[in-house]
Amino acid sequence: AITEAREEAKPYPLFPGPLPGSLQTDHTSLLSLPHTSGYQPALMFSPTQPGRPYTGNVAIPRVTSAGSKLLPPLAFKHTVGHIILSEHKDVKFNCSISVPNIYQDTTISWWKDGKELLGAHHAITQFYPDDEVTAIIASFSITSVQRSDNGSYICKMKINNEEIVSDPIYIEVQGLPHFTKQPESMNVTRNTAFNLTCQAVGPPEPVNIFWVQNSSRVNEQPEKSPSVLTVPGLTEMAVFSCEAHNDKGLTVSKGVQINIKAIPSPPTEVSIHNSTAHSILISWVPGFDGYSPFRNCSVQVKEVDPLSNGSVMIFNTSASPHMYQIKQLQALANYSIGVSCMNEIGWSAVSPWILASTTEGAPSVAPLNVTVFLNESRDNVDIRWMKPLTKRQAGELVGYRISHVWQSAGISKELLEEVGQNNSRAQISVQVHNATCTVRIAAVTKGGVGPFSDPVKIFIPAHGWVDHAPSSTPAPGNADPVLII
């Protein structure tokens, strides 16, 4: 049996009061002091079983210094076993022992839950010497107790390599319920059940839980902690909290918002970053995600042309980054572009449509009938061709690019010439004699350089050779050109 000191119970209508037969105290007091001084403590506690010899951790001295009479066994006196008090109160408790004067250098240490209490603790040891024995009172005080002060406190004393251990003094700090698990904010599917958890601890126990949804109590009667609330489904956002009750009162958890997942809002601010002949780089600002992460987006492209069939091209892309390069477009065309994104619930509406245009493209065909012949008198090569049949989308012709490669005895050199769009002939200087010259021509627009014509080769002899026959590419066709000398 243990003696308990306990503060007065504050009745709370929902819950049973203090344990029967227990005492409560919130007083700062010296408990169970066998005082030799005139000080009278506020509360006195007698041992649980007065007169019973204590046979626990005791040191039994062999003999006195004279070697004649035996001394009684050494033991700490019984004191209060259990102190119950509220958080932020002060508490003081003690151990006392009477030690024969033959023992020198006795020290008492305090231990909590098996660990020695060192440093900044308020422990005071007082000595009251008498003729044969010295009464030692070790007191320990805690100001403004906290839950972390809960535990089992003991005194230890070393005498002649023997250790004497006191009965434990159990300190129980009581307060309002303390949450160890609170409900968490969640995003949930409409009309789908989900769970919320609430757990709180004392002391004092029991702790009982009430759930609150949008300010209304869900459970009419308290549920023991921990409590799991299965919410049967929501059609709109709701706020949940839980109330934890014990004999000391009530603690309310944080309120958490439970959101209903929905389709995202449409993206906004679709903008054009770069246009080429066959691609457009766009970006957008994602709309609200509907409380569910975006999965992917869809870029929808319609050609704005009265003659087009109005079909929509759809390009799927990841939701991030919020950018996409639309490819495989026609040059010099107008398009209407919209973006839609999806989450687990579904697709958003399409963003506001924006207009964008591709630039003019490079020519898609090479110049025709390329003819090359040597003008030996002037020491240059004459090149002639026919203007290619380009589509409107390729834009206006701005000129031609001529590539001529000179090959002789393992040496190869490529040169490029640019000529205006009005020309259909050009002359280039002979770079090397006794060599082969290979000529290719490409049409050029603002959109870029088109494909080169098939190569036409002509042999440039050493000085004195005459060659008036031209080399040419057949028009049109893919047959290898013939070199005529």
Epitope: P13, W211, N219, E220, Q221, G233
Partner: antibody
């Protein structure tokens, strides 16, 4: 299994009192509230209120204060409805029901017919 | 208090037909419960919290709704479904019931 068993029919004179019992079994009585519902002949259901079986605290709906008293004997897992100063208009079937979360009445007693007639 | 209005008061249908019962609340409520009552019997729980079937209730019963408008649907009436149906709100005290809808055989 969960059961709510109500006392038998009562025939009372105006001005008398009646006490209807509702004995619960198959669950921990003090974990769930007990609701009382009235149904007058040929009429719909009318919620009278409930009693907290953990604290014994009753809650009465408007129109059921004064002459109506909810009580408990937790030792025998029983809830009681007492009506005093009976009137002819108190003639009805009185049901007890177990209250679950969200005030859902998940189990019902079989009902007790109280007839008030001179 | 929240007043619950059930409509229609009486619904005359044949077995196999679809029954749609309405319950309107005078102000918004989070959940609606539904009960079935046959003559001389206690009410029987049917639907918990708007759309959850009570144990042992067949899948032809379903509930839906939110705010102030709730519906109980019986997809194909069986002979044993002809009864009176009551809605009951959860959100605020007192815990009110609707006036009931009687589903009778046509």
């Amino acid at each position: 299994q969960v059961q709510l068993v109500q006392s038998g029919s009562e025939l009372k004179k105006p001005g008398a009192s009646v006490k209807v019992s509702c004995k619960a079994s198959g669950y921990t009585f003090t974990n769930y509230g007990v609701h009382w519902v009235r149904q007058a002949p040929g009429q719909g259901l009318e919620w009278m209120g409930w009693i907290n079986t953990y604290t014994g605290e009753p809650t009465y709906a408007q129109g059921f204060t004064g002459r109506f008293v909810f009580s408990l004997d937790t030792s025998v897992s029983t809830a009681y409805l007492q009506i005093s100063s009976l009137k002819a208009e108190d003639t009805a079937v009185y049901y007890c029901a177990r209250g679950y979360r969200y005030a859902y009445m998940d189990y019902w007693g079989q009902g007790t017919l109280v007839t008030v007639s001179s | 208090e929240i007043v619950l209005t059930q409509s229609p008061a009486t619904l005359s249908l044949s077995p196999g037909e679809r029954a749609t019962l309405s319950c309107r609340a005078s102000s918004s409520t989070s959940y609606m419960h539904w009960y079935q009552q046959k003559p001389g019997q206690a009410p029987r729980p049917l639907i918990y919290a708007t759309s959850n079937l009570a144990s042992g209730i067949p899948a032809r019963f379903s509930g839906s709704g939110s705010g102030t408008s709730y519906t109980l649907t019986i997809s194909s009436l069986e002979p044993e479904d002809f009864a009176v149906y009551y809605c009951q709100q959860w959100s605020s005290n007192p815990r009110t019931f609707g006036g009931g809808t009687k589903v009778e055989i046509k």
